[in-house]
C-alpha cells in the first residue's frame, strides 16, 4: 500500500528540495522562503525570486517554508509555573521551562506544569531529579513512600499499601497496646 500524501506533499514532491510547486502553474518550481521569513508572493516564473518577507515581531518560522503567514510565538504558561528560557525570535519559537530544582510534569503532549523536586527528607536520593522526572526517594526504616515523600509509619493505616513496609512498626504498636491490658 502506498502511503496517502496530502495535496501539499504531492505538490512539493514534484519539485527539487528547497523548492515548491507554484499553486497556479504546476510547471513552475519556486524557491521556498528561508526560516524567519514567510511567503508574500509566489515567484512570477522559472528562475525568478519568490517574494519572501521577514516575520513581524511576535511571530516566527523555524524552517524553510511557503507559509502565507508566520506562526504566532508561544507564551509560557505562568499558571503552570513555567518561565521563559529564551525569547521568541523571527526564526525560533519561545522556549519555556522550569526554575532550578523543579521538573516538568506533562499533562498532555505539549502542556507541562512545573513542580518542585522532592528533597527526600527522612530518606535518601535513589535517582536525582531530572528535567522531566521527579527525584526517586528511598525511605529510611520507620518511614514509607507516599506521593514521593517519606512519611512516618505512625501514619500508616491498615487499609493502605504501606502495611507491608511498616509491618514491624505496626506489630510493635499492637504489642505495646496488648501488653498494657495484661
Amino acid at each position: 500500500l502506498v502511503p496517502h500524501l496530502g495535496d501539499r506533499e504531492k505538490r512539493d514532491s514534484v519539485c527539487p528540495q528547497g523548492k515548491y510547486i507554484h499553486p497556479q502553474n504546476n510547471s513552475i518550481c519556486c524557491t521556498k522562503c528561508h526560516k524567519g521569513t514567510y511567503l508574500y508572493n509566489d515567484c512570477p516564473g522559472p528562475g525568478q525570486d519568490t517574494d519572501c518577507r521577514e516575520c513581524e515581531s511576535g511571530s516566527f518560522t523555524a524552517s524553510e517554508n511557503h507559509l502565507r503567514h508566520c506562526l504566532s510565538c508561544s507564551k509560557c504558561r505562568k499558571e503552570m509555573g513555567q518561565v521563559e528560557i529564551s525569547s521568541c525570535t523571527v526564526d525560533r519559537d519561545t522556549v519555556c521551562g522550569c526554575r532550578k530544582n523543579q521538573y516538568r510534569h506533562y499533562w498532555s503532549e505539549n502542556l507541562f506544569q512545573c513542580f518542585n523536586c522532592s528533597l527526600c527528607l527522612n530518606g535518601t536520593v535513589h535517582l536525582s531529579c531530572q528535567e522531566k522526572q521527579n527525584t526517586v526517594c528511598t525511605c529510611h526504616a520507620g518511614f514509607f513512600l507516599r506521593e514521593n515523600e517519606c512519611v512516618s509509619c505512625s501514619n500508616c493505616k491498615k487499609s493502605l499499601e504501606c502495611t507491608k513496609l511498616c509491618l514491624p512498626q505496626i506489630e510493635n504498636v499492637k504489642g505495646t497496646e496488648d501488653s498494657g491490658t495484661t
Epitope: 510534569h105 499533562w107 498532555s108 503532549e109 506544569q113 513542580f115 521527579n134 506521593e147
Partner: nanobody
Framework: EVQLLESGGGLVQPGGSLRLSCAAS????????MGWVRQAPGKGLEWVSF????????YYADSVKGRFTISRDNSKNTLYLQMNSLRAEDTAVYYC??????????WGQGTLVTVSS
C-alpha cells in the same frame, strides 16, 4: 460503561465550605487523570482543578488556588473537591470528568453549588 456520579453540592453562605465527591465506575480509575470543571450561569466551561492518576500532581485555576483542594482515593474510585472560603462567583454546576490528554472524555451529570446569603 463509564459512569461518573457527583454529589455534595447545595446552598451555602459566602465564606462557607462544601465537599464534592465523584464516584467513578466502568474504567480503570487508577490509570486516569481526573478533573473538576464548572459552568457558571450563562457562562462557558472553566477548568477548576485536575489531579494526576497517582494523586501526586495537581493543578488549580488561579481563581480557586488556596481555597480549593482536589484529592482522590484510588481504593474507593472516588474523586473529591474540598471547597473552602466560598464566594458568590463560585456559584456553578460542577462536573467531574475523566481527563485524557487535557480533553475531558467522560463527564458526570453535574452537581449545583449555590453561594448566596
Amino acid at each position: 460503561e463509564v459512569q461518573l456520579l457527583e454529589s455534595g453540592g447545595g446552598l451555602v453562605q459566602p465564606g462557607g465550605s462544601l465537599r464534592l465527591s465523584c464516584a467513578a465506575s466502568g474504567f480503570t480509575f487508577t490509570e486516569y487523570n481526573m478533573g473538576w470543571v464548572r459552568q457558571a450561569p450563562g457562562k462557558g466551561l472553566e477548568w477548576v482543578s485536575f489531579i494526576g492518576h497517582s494523586g501526586q500532581h495537581t493543578y488549580y485555576a488561579d481563581s480557586v488556588k488556596g481555597r480549593f483542594t482536589i484529592s482522590r482515593d484510588n481504593s474507593k474510585n472516588t474523586l473529591y473537591l474540598q471547597m473552602n472560603s466560598l464566594r458568590a462567583e463560585d456559584t456553578a454546576v460542577y462536573y467531574c470528568a475523566e481527563l485524557n490528554n487535557l480533553m475531558f472524555d467522560y463527564w458526570g451529570q453535574g452537581t449545583l453549588v449555590t453561594v448566596s446569603s
